[in-house]
Amino acid sequence: NKILVKQSPMLVAYDNAVNLSCKYSYNLFSREFRASLHKGLDSAVEVCVVYGNYSQQLQVYSKTGFNCDGKLGNESVTFYLQNLYVNQTDIYFCKIEVMYPPPYLDNEKSNGTIIHVKGKHLCPSPLFPGPSKP
């Protein structure tokens, strides 16, 4: 038995930040779980982890180079990614594992979310504007 995960197909980070919501076909209330966010088609790079259990507050871990926060809903974990760089544009996959109570459960691989990080294109005003046309 596998948990199903729904993610937005694409998100655009205009201000170098984005909220990626991972929606699960499973209620995480009073469960011990580990939710993670993986970068790349092969999910090779785990960038954020949210660990939760019934007795302590949510714990969030960010890999070096990523600024991550996490928020828990009954059937969702939202990853808030900040200070993203243009070169972090990629596909990101949500993963969930539930350890307790038994049985151990994890998810079917989701379709992922393409996060497109838009660079800030600032147009500098010229110091010495040319002669104005009549």
Partner: nanobody, 124 residues
Framework: EVQLVESGGGEVQPGGSLRLSCAAS????????MGWFRQAPGKGREFVAA????????DYAESVKGRFTISRDNAKNTVYLQMNSLRAEDTAVYYC?????????????????WGQGTLVTVKP
């Protein structure tokens, strides 16, 4: 809940070697990391080395690179620290830590559980 038990500490002469072990038990997820930190008398706990479950990510403190090697046996849920060319400044209590992060974190705050520590003494 995760329990960590360290072993392998002892007294050794400068230039000598020791191998520390840390066995983890409890509920494990598909990825996590374990690391070694050390605390010399009167100093804070400092990062030594870490490795993740997949064994595709390891990290070392600059002061131990080339001398210490971290490895793990996933079947035994055990991580090892092979310490060669030991120096007097390596004398400390060595602690094993466990984190739910899936990478070799050097941040002490990322570690959720700690072992009781094992003393390493390097002296002539």
């Amino acid at each position: 809940e995760v329990q960590l038990v360290e072993s392998g500490g002892g007294e050794v002469q400068p230039g000598g070697s020791l191998r520390l072990s840390c066995a983890a038990s409890g509920r494990m997820f598909s990825n996590y990391a374990m690391g070694w930190f050390r605390q010399a008398p009167g100093k804070g706990r400092e990062f030594v080395a870490a490795i993740n479950y997949r064994r595709d990510d390891a990290d070392y403190a600059e002061s131990v690179k080339g001398r210490f090697t971290i490895s793990r046996d996933n079947a035994k849920n055990t991580v090892y620290l092979q310490m060669n060319s030991l120096r007097a400044e390596d004398t400390a209590v060595y602690y094993c830590g466990f984190t739910y992060a899936g990478w070799a974190s050097s941040r002490r705050d990322d570690y959720n559980y700690w072992g009781q520590g094992t003393l390493v003494t390097v002296k002539p």
